[in-house]
């Protein structure tokens, strides 16, 4: 994780900063949302547990043509140790519920903020 984050500052950043940057980006998305996010696209809901970052990326990467979440997708790829491509579901253990991207982002944000407040940066 020490190589994460080059979006806001050059060079390596600590894991706490990388997580903070991801939270900031998700906050910006939720606060700046005017029309339905990504035209109301639906994505697979995920379990917010171990492997969450890869699962989140695998779910969101299937949304194309949505500039609002492109930065989030790039950030999540920095947290996920393996390469993720569209249609790949190795980390999405349960694929039974689809939700709107906007709700997905809100749920992810709440969980990431809790991790940050707890000091769980890795």
């Amino acid at each position: 994780l020490t190589c994460l984050g080059g979006f806001a500052s050059p060079g390596p950043v600590p894991p706490s900063t990388a997580l903070r940057e991801l939270i900031e980006e998700l906050v910006n998305i939720t606060q700046n949302q005017k029309a339905p996010l990504c035209n109301g696209s639906m994505v697979w809901s995920i379990n917010l547990t171990a492997g969450m970052y890869c699962a989140a990326l695998e779910s969101l990467i299937n949304v194309s043509g949505c500039s609002a979440i492109e930065k989030t997708q790039r950030m999540l790829s920095g947290f996920c140790p393996h390469k993720v491509s569209a249609g790949q579901f190795s980390s999405l253990h349960v694929r039974d519920t689809k939700i709107e991207v906007a709700q997905f982002v809100k749920d992810l944000l709440l969980h990431l903020k809790k991790l940050f407040r707890e000091g769980q940066f890795n």
Epitope: A8, S9, S16, R20, Q31, K113, K114, E118
Partner: antibody
Framework: EVTLRESGPGLVKPTQTLTLTCTLY??????????VDWIRQPPGKGLEWLAH???????RYNPALKSRLTISKDTSKNQVVLKLTSVDPVDTATYYC???????????????WGQGTLVTVSS | DIQMTQSPSSLSASVGDRVTISCRAS??????LNWYQQKPGKAPKLLIF???KLHSGVPSRFSGSGSGTDYTLTISSLQPEDIATYYC?????????FGGGTKVEIK
Amino acid sequence: EVTLRESGPGLVKPTQTLTLTCTLYGFSLSTSDMGVDWIRQPPGKGLEWLAHIWWDDVKRYNPALKSRLTISKDTSKNQVVLKLTSVDPVDTATYYCARTVSSGYIYYAMDYWGQGTLVTVSS
Amino acid sequence: DIQMTQSPSSLSASVGDRVTISCRASQDIRNYLNWYQQKPGKAPKLLIFYTSKLHSGVPSRFSGSGSGTDYTLTISSLQPEDIATYYCQQGNTLPLTFGGGTKVEIK
């Protein structure tokens, strides 16, 4: 109106445990995004952050004092309690509680403070 | 821990003067810098959070700026009621840490 009020013993003997209570008015610690911090200020000196507790019971401490500190909340009474064990004269200070909110970014900015309670550690 | 260094430790200025107080962090705090005002015998009050956002009820003569490790609090026109000690505080990384304070007096 948001207000916080600290209460404490005033005088504590060395080696004893200091118990401080912060009563919250105008907001509830059961509300999402709310947190309460404890900060202290020795006479004529600067501010030192001690601990905080969030609405969902996430607790964080200053590592320099972590082994001696315990923070807890009583939502029904809208109170936050801080305990500091094995006190020493260097713990003499005004102890403040303050509110923190994390609705957007997590700023860790304390937007409302209590008036403070002076605690003297002396035999 | 992140060390916060304020300068000057004290200053004296005339009513109407522009006053600036500096705060330097030992590492990048990414704009998570808050300013407090403490009057003698009173609790601190939040003036500015996240470098430049004015807390509700704070007069517009107070402003904040900076980035990275260097931050500034400015009082555009000093008033008698601004006599106080001002503290910066970083909110980027726990433990939260404060600067040593800057005491502002009227000439």
